[in-house]
């Protein structure tokens, strides 16, 4: 039975040209995390494999940095980066857990940030 829950940064906003950390945390399970995939719609942004480390998809290599931890840092943000992001936790023996984050990239000089996991 899948007992785990994913806590995410939820709905967040950031300034155009800036950077933001996407962060998820899996809790309430003893399942082993084998891999975490970061996705945007049908695009795979990055994979963090427990044994092999990070793979950043070539489409995003210039603007995506691994970490901190299992999180992902998006850099040089544009308005087109606005949208849903998903962290997919592949675990054994539970299976797959999915977390959702909504990012809004703002043109204005002042962007409201969510309370957790954000770059100050």
């Amino acid at each position: 039975m899948m007992t785990g829950t994913i806590e995410t940064t939820g709905n967040i906003s950031a300034e155009k040209g800036g950077s933001i950390i996407l962060q998820c945390h899996l809790s309430s399970t003893t399942a082993q995390v084998t891999q975490v995939n970061w996705e945007q719609q049908d695009q795979l942004l990055a994979i963090c494999n427990a044994d092999l480390g990070w793979h950043i998809s070539p489409s995003f290599k210039d603007r995506v940095a691994p970490g901190p931890g299992l999180g992902l840092t998006l850099q040089s943000l544009t308005v087109n980066d606005t949208g849903e992001y998903f962290c997919i936790y592949h675990t054994y023996p539970d299976g797959t857990y999915t977390g959702r984050i909504f990012l809004e990239v703002l043109e204005s000089s002042v962007a409201e940030h969510g309370a957790r996991f954000q770059i100050p």
């Epitope: 084998t34 891999q35 995939n37 996705e39 049908d42 695009q43 795979l44 994979i47 494999n49 427990a50 044994d51 092999l52 480390g53 990070w54 793979h55 998809s57 070539p58 489409s59 592949h90």
Partner: antibody
Framework: EVQLQESGPGLVKPSETLSLTCAVS????????WNWIRQPPGKKLEYIGY???????YYNPSLKSRVTISRDTSKNQFSLKLSSVTAADTAVYYC??????????????WGQGTTVTVSS | DIVMTQTPLSLSVTPGQPASISCKAS??????VAWYLQKPGQSPQLMIY???YRYTGVPDRFSGSGSGTDFTLKISRVEAEDVGVYYC?????????FGGGTKVEIK
């Protein structure tokens, strides 16, 4: 250039253990991921498992109870052991390198393959 | 496990003509797909990774496309050296799995 060379017996009796070794030249096995893949006659390529740069292993769940992948860093080689073999384990066995950081799970260097037949 | 299904099983192409191979995944694998060519008597060689990126040294007549569950490998103008069996592979999640292969021959 990275070169991989499989070696081991071409004939194994049913219920015995298949043992293969892959000698690697031109690259250290303490970097990247080192893999075994097989292809039974007329069937799909099947991923067996890997040993990572740090020595961690992953085995395909369909073979997990019978597979051991190990390495000898002093000889720059890694090995496959598959126990309790049957005729279904008859295949061409490939050792291969995977550069996860750059190519994800895409295998960029392959050995030439060695044919193993399981028969009494 | 994710099942990768390739079509057609075989393809006979006139030199200079285009060729197209399809690969369907049993579930969404985003863009975590690679393509290989296994020439007669040789090991597989990597052609495409991340669905659409050519590996080092692969001629630009080869192109990959797709995301989600449907992927395509195209050869814009087939040459004699392109014969062999083409395989797709997903690496979205372990165990990484391969398609059954498409054999490309020259007419």
């Amino acid at each position: 250039e990275v070169q991989l060379q499989e070696s081991g017996p071409g004939l194994v009796k049913p219920s015995e253990t298949l043992s293969l070794t892959c000698a690697v030249s031109g690259y250290s096995i303490t970097s990247d991921s080192w893999n075994w893949i097989r292809q039974p006659p007329g069937k799909k390529l099947e991923y067996i498992g890997y040993i990572s740069y740090s020595g961690n292993t992953y085995y395909n769940p369909s073979l997990k109870s019978r597979v051991t992948i190990s390495r000898d860093t002093s000889k720059n080689q890694f090995s496959l052991k598959l126990s309790s073999v049957t005729a279904a384990d008859t295949a061409v066995y490939y050792c291969a390198r995977l550069d996860f950081s750059n190519y994800g799970g895409a295998v960029d260097y392959w050995g030439q393959g060695t044919t193993v037949t399981v028969s009494s | 496990d994710i099942v990768m299904t390739q079509t057609p099983l075989s393809l006979s192409v006139t030199p200079g003509q285009p060729a197209s191979i399809s690969c369907k995944a049993s579930q969404n694998v985003r863009t975590a797909v690679a393509w290989y060519l296994q020439k007669p008597g040789q090991s597989p060689q990597l052609m495409i990774y991340s669905a659409s990126y050519r590996y080092t040294g692969v001629p630009d007549r080869f192109s990959g496309s797709g995301s989600g569950t449907d992927f395509t490998l195209k050869i814009s103008r087939v040459e004699a050296e392109d014969v062999g069996v083409y395989y797709c592979q997903q690496y979205y999640t372990t165990p990484w799995t391969f398609g059954g292969g498409t054999k490309v021959e020259i007419k």
